[in-house]
């Protein structure tokens, strides 16, 4: 039979950050290759990463078509000899379906992790500082342009700012559902800043890691009386 000595894929894992989405699995193939299929709940299966010896498949192009859809994926284990005849032989020589393993369902809007944010700039005017978070571009498209994280999540995305005097350990925090903070500071003091992205409506993957710390007196900042 065409499926002899094939090992079904296992440990299927979605790795997704800011919608860049890769399906990973095990084991490393021996005398077999893999083909991945993806579909929406109501759609047809689409094959990707045909007859690959990799144990990952980038499915970003598919999931960014509609990040609020639910996606199903499966990994077929195809005997090496069947994979040499072209794409039409995903099914074995006797027409039987090769073994496959289903991934858990994937909802990009809910499941993609938030990437580490970056502080784009900060500007001091007197006793106020305006801190701006970089609005990271995603691979989600609308009308032929790439959308930013804010475009995709809108007010579902908030940022938490941690800030503290360079000379002190006591931190303060502020939040915004835009990409800008306007905070009060003591004149003549240098401050450090770090931000974190949060999606309040989620129950898991709610928070990003903290951004790199940026401090006043470094090149990102500007000072005006």
């Amino acid at each position: 039979s065409g499926t002899t000595n094939t090992v079904a894929a296992y440990n299927l894992t979605w790795k997704s950050t800011n919608f860049k989405t890769i399906l990973e699995w095990e084991p490393k193939p021996v005398n077999q290759v893999y083909t991945v299929q993806i579909s929406t709940k109501s759609g047809d299966w689409k094959s990707k990463c045909f007859y690959t010896t990799d144990t990952e498949c980038d499915l970003t192009d598919e999931i960014v078509k509609d990040v609020k859809q639910t996606y199903l994926a499966r990994v077929f284990s195809v005997p090496w000899r069947n994979s040499t005849h072209g794409k039409e032989t995903l099914f074995g020589t006797h027409g039987e379906e090769p073994p496959f393993t289903n991934a858990r369902k994937f909802l990009p809007y809910r499941d993609t992790k938030l990437g580490q944010p970056t502080i784009q700039s900060f500007e001091q005017v007197g006793t106020k500082v305006n801190v701006t978070v970089e609005d990271e571009r995603t691979l989600v498209r609308r009308n032929n342009t790439f959308l930013s994280l804010r475009d995709v999540f809108g007010k579902d995305l908030i940022y938490t700012l941690y800030y503290w005097k360079s000379s002190s350990s006591g931190k303060k925090t502020a939040k915004t559902n835009t990409n800008e903070f306007l905070i009060d500071v003591d004149k003549g003091e240098n401050y450090c800043f770090s931000v974190q992205a949060v999606i309040p409506s989620r129950t898991v993957n709610r928070k990003s890691t903290d951004s790199p710390v940026e401090c006043m007196g470094q090149e990102k900042g500007e000072f005006r009386e």
Epitope: K175, V198, P200, V204, D210
Partner: antibody, heavy 117, light 107 residues
Framework: QVQLVESGGGVVQPGRSLRLSCKAS????????MHWVRQAPGKGLEWIGL????????IYDPKFQGRFTISADNSKNTLFLQMDSLRPEDTAVYYC??????????WGQGTPVTVSS | DIQMTQSPSSLSASVGDRVTITCKAS??????LNWYQQKPGKAPKLLIY???SLADGVPSRFSGSGSGTDYTFTISSLQPEDIATYYC?????????FGQGTKLEIT
């Protein structure tokens, strides 16, 4: 279901220390910001501070900074409030609360602390 | 630090009355304002978040309005079970601050 249960309250002498615990179930504390709030008898609510258990960041009301310390043990899914140099005016019911970033959505039942000689 | 001034500190009203409580912030809190109800011996319960959004399971007679520094909480038709103390909370920046509370009684 989501639940927060405080413990560790009681009667303590002025100048002594007390450590309160808040055991969470039904969710992972590291996914949320967690807060301590207190309420003195017959008085209003008073915010003490917060922790992001995932990275250990803590923020306090300046009036509690240095005397109170918030920490978390993610493996035990538990939040702590270490209170040092206690004073009679620290007598209150102490609540822990979960913060979804738009609101405190779950609160514990509170644990009473009495500071008295 | 942001101060929250809540008024009145107490009020008495009749069943069916429209009740209004206000909170004024010492600076713009960008709608990061919640309203909580607390009954004796119980933890606070969320009623309104982000100034105007009704929390899940909360009756529609409760509502919130406002932006900037001025916020209002309204009970459109007071019910006996609404006897409680009500607090506003700003959480736009630390230290988070509660209003002093409004104790609501029925005449």
């Amino acid at each position: 279901q989501v639940q927060l249960v405080e413990s560790g309250g009681g009667v303590v002498q002025p100048g002594r220390s007390l450590r309160l615990s808040c055991k969470a179930s039904g969710f992972n504390i590291k996914d949320y910001y967690m807060h301590w709030v207190r309420q003195a008898p017959g008085k209003g609510l008073e915010w003490i501070g917060l922790i992001d258990p995932e990275n250990g960041n803590t923020i306090y009301d300046p009036k509690f900074q240095g005397r109170f310390t918030i920490s978390a043990d993610n493996s035990k899914n538990t939040l702590f409030l270490q209170m040092d140099s206690l004073r009679p005016e620290d007598t209150a019911v102490y609540y822990c609360a979960r913060d979804n970033s738009y609101y405190f959505d779950y609160w514990g039942q509170g644990t009473p602390v009495t500071v008295s000689s | 630090d942001i101060q929250m001034t809540q008024s009145p500190s107490s009020l008495s009203a009749s069943v069916g009355d429209r009740v209004t409580i206000t909170c004024k912030a010492s600076q713009d809190i960008r709608k990061y304002l919640n309203w909580y109800q607390q009954k004796p011996g119980k933890a606070p319960k969320l009623l309104i978040y982000y100034a105007t959004s009704l929390a899940d399971g909360v009756p529609s007679r409760f509502s919130g309005s406002g932006s900037g520094t001025d916020y209002t909480f309204t009970i459109s038709s007071l019910q006996p079970e609404d006897i409680a103390t009500y607090y506003c909370l700003q959480h736009g920046e630390s230290p988070y601050t509660f209003g002093q509370g409004t104790k609501l009684e029925i005449t």
